[in-house]
């Protein structure tokens, strides 16, 4: 598989690695989300490991307000992180692809 | 870096690998998109390599109708593919996480 295809596989499998632990096996509850963020996206969380920070992240992702994060909400979240990474990428002249 | 962080890096770097070839270096034109899909997501395209198929994909991705695909539109596209992969994942009992 090509790197981009593998990346999509990782996105799917990582979600299910945590969503399958408690409650609805196709959704992340707060405990599962906390574990996913702490273990799989430590650079995103940084030092914000207090309970209120997790509650805020959860609330921001949970667009249908069911106290869980479904796969679509998770994808929107990852897209937001990717867009933040992209802004950083575009802002670094040494990392940019050659000028057209 | 953790696999999910690497996956996000791949998403960003793959976009710029192709967007940097012609025209606006932060957007994919039709030629760049065609090359990205053919080389990086061959399993998505399958046998649909005719011009009409590419036009249809381009039209679906280009939500702001500027005949180019920006990073946000590309993320929406990848989210859609991930969601299709996820539906397949959820539909395969042998691939599912354990029942809760």
């Amino acid at each position: 598989a090509r790197p981009l295809e593998e990346a999509l596989d990782v996105i799917v499998s990582t979600f299910h690695k945590y969503s399958g632990k408690e409650g609805d096996k196709f959704k992340l509850n707060k405990t599962e989300l906390k574990e996913l963020l702490t273990r799989e996206l430590p650079s995103f969380l940084g030092k914000r490991t207090d309970e209120a920070a997790f509650q805020k992240v959860m609330s921001n992702l949970d667009s249908n307000r069911d106290n869980e994060v479904d796969f679509q909400e998770y994808c929107v979240f990852l897209s937001c992180i990717a867009m933040m990474c992209n802004e950083f990428f575009e802002g670094c002249p040494d990392k940019e692809p050659r000028k057209k | 870096a953790r696999p999910l962080e690497e996956a996000l890096d791949v998403i960003v770097s793959t976009f710029h690998k192709y967007s940097g070839k012609e025209g606006d270096k932060f957007k994919l034109n039709k030629t760049e998109l065609k090359e990205l899909l053919t080389r990086e997501l061959p399993s998505f395209l399958g046998k649909r390599t005719d011009e009409a198929a590419f036009q249809k994909v381009m039209s679906n991705l280009d939500s702001n109708r500027d005949n180019e695909v920006d990073f946000q539109e590309y993320c929406v596209f990848l989210s859609c593919i991930a969601m299709m992969c996820n539906e397949f994942f959820e539909g395969c009992p042998d691939k599912e996480p354990r029942k809760k």
Epitope: G23, Q55, K56, M58, S59, N60, S63, N64, D66, N67 | -
Partner: antibody, heavy 120, light 107 residues
């Protein structure tokens, strides 16, 4: 201290549109909260109308959805409600509330409420 | 929609009494149950969220319990300022729904 203040006409004619605005002070429209409308009928029953939140995400009560419109103006720290084709059954005290990000998303701050009477 | 049923609809009690109000949901709400107190002419005030967590500034005589579909609000020793109407509300899913209220009156 967070304060919410509803404003709008107290009397609306049947078939017209009810328009209310809520002004938030002591807190800005951060992405951490959803901003709600709830009404209380003369018989004291409470009904959730809808809310607006993160990234402008809006959810409406399905029973009102086809008559409802909500928006926000972050520069003024305000959010608004429009309910069209009103009838006497829409007579109620209308509250704006803040929805906390804690488990169960409780309504932790409320405006004092504004009575809207639908009558010709 | 999830239906919320409160009982009793009203009760009479004296200062110092232990008061219990129950709330039943039409389906499992996974402890996402909030309680509010309302006094005449005023807006409701949050008392407890997520079944048993006390909102800031709320006296410890208020407590909550329950799981699944059945929940309880308890006032361990009723005070003069506690005479009011109490509402439960589910935060499990949209649309949010409230119980019909329980009016606590002076005996």
């Amino acid at each position: 201290q967070v304060q919410l203040q509803e404003s709008g006409p107290g009397l609306v004619k049947p078939s017209q549109t009810l328009s209310l605005t809520c002004t938030v002070s002591g807190d800005s429209f951060t992405n951490d909260y959803y901003w709600n409308w709830i009404r209380q009928f003369p018989g004291k029953g409470l009904e959730w109308i809808g809310h607006i939140g993160y990234g402008g995400n809006i959810n409406y009560n399905p029973s009102l959805k086809n008559r409802l419109s909500m928006s926000r103006d972050t520069s003024k720290n305000q959010f608004s409600l429009k309910l069209s084709s009103v009838t006497a059954a829409d007579t109620a005290v209308y509250y704006c509330t803040r929805e906390s990000f804690y488990d169960g998303y409780p309504f932790d701050y409320w405006g004092q409420g504004t009575l809207v009477t639908v009558s010709s | 929609d999830i239906q919320m049923t409160q009982s009793p609809s009203s009760l009479s009690a004296s200062v110092g009494d232990r008061v219990t109000i129950t709330c039943r949901a039409s389906q499992d709400i996974r402890n996402y149950l909030n309680w509010y107190q309302q006094k005449p002419g005023k807006a409701p005030k949050l008392l407890l969220y997520y079944t048993s967590r006390l909102h800031s500034g709320v006296p410890s005589r208020f407590s909550g319990s329950g799981s699944g579909t059945d929940y309880t609000l308890t006032i361990s020793s009723l005070q003069p300022e506690d005479f009011a109407t109490y509402y439960c509300q589910q935060g499990n899913s949209l649309p949010r729904t409230f119980g019909g209220g329980t009016k606590v009156e002076i005996k």
